[in-house]
Interface confidence: low
Amino acid sequence: LSPQPGAGHDEGPGSGWAAKGTVRGWNRRARESPGHVSEPDRTQLSQDLGGGTLAMDTLPDNRTRVVEDNHSYYVSRLYGPSEPHSRELWVDVAEANRSQVKIHTILSNTHRQASRVVLSFDFPFYGHPLRQITIATGGFIFMGDVIHRMLTATQYVAPLMANFNPGYSDNSTVVYFDNGTVFVVQWDHVYLQGWEDKGSFTFQAALHHDGRIVFAYKEIPMSVPEISSSQHPVKTGLSDAFMILNPSPDVPESRRRSIFEYHRIELDPSKVTSMSAVEFTPLPTCLQHRSCDACMSSDLTFNCSWCHVLQRCSSGFDRYRQEWMDYGCAQEAEGRMCEDFQDEDHDSASPDTSFSPYDGDLTTTSSSLFIDSLTTEDDTKLNPYAGGDGLQNNLSPKTKGTPVHLGT
């Protein structure tokens, strides 16, 4: 790992440089303000549950601007190449316990491919505990539960989302590492499709059990703003969305799934350079509060409300929004204090508190619907073999195999 920054200072650069406020080097899209789901600057994805095409309805976002982030989920710190801390944030996968490192041979030999991986711990993403993620060859991790055709649109952790083709070179690998407290994905010596002469990229994303997310960049051979997005989106940052079901106007008995991006952090691509790193530290969210008192007395920047029937604290903007609406939580919480709930039957229509909107029919439906024809808008294919066939448990040179292609 050279050059190794030594004397420039470790934590210095990121210091105090947070997404909470107008910050140099970051553009925050004004997507997270509370309000009606249909507000015009939200990104919406819609999909017929009947297996129809997924349309991405992005309404004109002419309010995109650098804004003060008054709805923060993460504090973000950038460490420049002259920061020793950027070196410290790099996880040396080659030095890790071999049994915890896996070369994903399918991802390492193909282009526009994605594969599900199960974590050994619950990773809190925007306050939601996740056990499964989807690694894509295109330099990002899809964090959604429901696989759809537009993985690159939202619900991602993207150290550098671009049109990478690990299949171009035998030296290119997609490696991941899980030691029970951190999960690291490394895109190692990967080349941009059509831009192979620029050289190889090596970078990683680390998901820590405490919710921290680290992007570390070892080799970035070209200026990121110069990377073409004509064939594949180019993004660096985080995004999350919630999914709601509503009746389809065309087929009344069917339900249409819509995905709404409620928060996004975008890193200025010019800041992505060799030996730099970005660390996202999660801020408290409403979801962490387990009682009405804690919820209503929360001094978070979020407007937390308590839903008695769900026994859940929420701002209404998280992945459980469907339940929040279905159980009338928005209306229930309006103007009510915790004392107002004291006399109510604690068990009335109370579902399992660990229930998520993806736990029931939705997951089952989506799995059977998509598993045979899974392509994203950039033609990233899902590889269902999360374990076993697609993996090597060591760091020996990868062998070229026949790539598994799903869909068309």
Epitope: P3, G6, H9, G12, S15, G25, S82, K271
Partner: antibody
Framework: EVQLLESGGGLVQPGGSLKLSCAAS????????MSWVRQAPGKGLEWVSG????????YYADSVKGRFTISRDNSKNTLYLQMNSLRAEDTAVYYC??????????WGQGTLVTVSS | QSVLTQPPSVSGAPGQRVTISCTGS?????????VHWYQQLPGTAPKLLIY???NRPSGVPDRFSGSKSGTSASLAITGLQAEDEADYYC???????????FGGGTKLTVL
């Protein structure tokens, strides 16, 4: 307004010691790495030493390693440079600077250290 | 001998454009490390002029601009004014030495 105010400079004999201080205000001191940069009379700038936000990590130029010690007291918003075994070539104006993203965003007015017999 | 090389002096008439070069090597500027520029007016402390190769802190006139290519960088000053007369220093990071490094400084004289 960000202010960095150095003090403690003066005339000292070769082999002697001196302790420089830098009082910081106008920003959250513990959020920033800090550095000392010096400038010999009529010469250019030379990075001397740096310290991480919490003070756990310290860094030195080869020319001062083993003789100078950088430290900080975040409760007092103060940066220090303990200089021992001073030499004539250490004569310079010493600046403390706030460090961010690889550059020195704010500088103090400097304090002159003269090493002479 | 400074790690980064700058011309000792440059000069220009008011209103003219001048450039100051800063040449490094493959272990600093050429390795991709950012270049920063400082202005030091006579008898005062250095002031950050350009950071991250091309960015101006608030309060710095847009007459000042920075660029970087390969192992060198340059500072351009357009519409030269008398108050621009000062010493200018470039700074980067050297991965081999493991330290912040400065250029030797360039004295700008406004004729």
């Amino acid at each position: 307004e960000v202010q960095l105010l150095e003090s403690g400079g003066g005339l000292v004999q070769p082999g002697g010691s001196l302790k420089l201080s830098c009082a910081a205000s106008g920003f959250t001191f513990s959020d920033y790495a800090m550095s000392w940069v010096r400038q010999a009379p009529g010469k250019g700038l030379e990075w001397v030493s740096g310290i991480s936000r919490g003070g756990a990590r310290t860094y030195y130029a080869d020319s001062v390693k083993g003789r100078f010690t950088i430290s900080r007291d975040n409760s007092k918003n103060t940066l220090y440079l303990q200089m021992n075994s001073l030499r004539a070539e250490d004569t310079a104006v010493y600046y403390c600077a706030r460090y961010l993203f690889g550059h020195y965003m704010d500088w103090g007015q400097g304090t002159l250290v003269t090493v002479s017999s | 001998q400074s790690v980064l090389t700058q011309p000792p002096s440059v000069s220009g008439a008011p209103g003219q454009r001048v450039t100051i070069s800063c040449t490094g090597s493959s272990s600093n500027i050429g390795a991709g490390y950012d270049v920063h520029w400082y202005q030091q007016l006579p008898g005062t402390a250095p002031k950050l002029l350009i950071y991250g190769n091309t960015n101006r802190p608030s309060g710095v006139p847009d007459r000042f601009s920075g660029s970087k290519s390969g192992t060198s960088a340059s500072l351009a000053i357009t519409g030269l004014q008398a108050e621009d007369e000062a010493d200018y220093y470039c700074q980067s990071y050297d991965g081999r030495l493991g330290v912040s490094v400065f250029g030797g400084g360039t004295k700008l004289t406004v004729l």
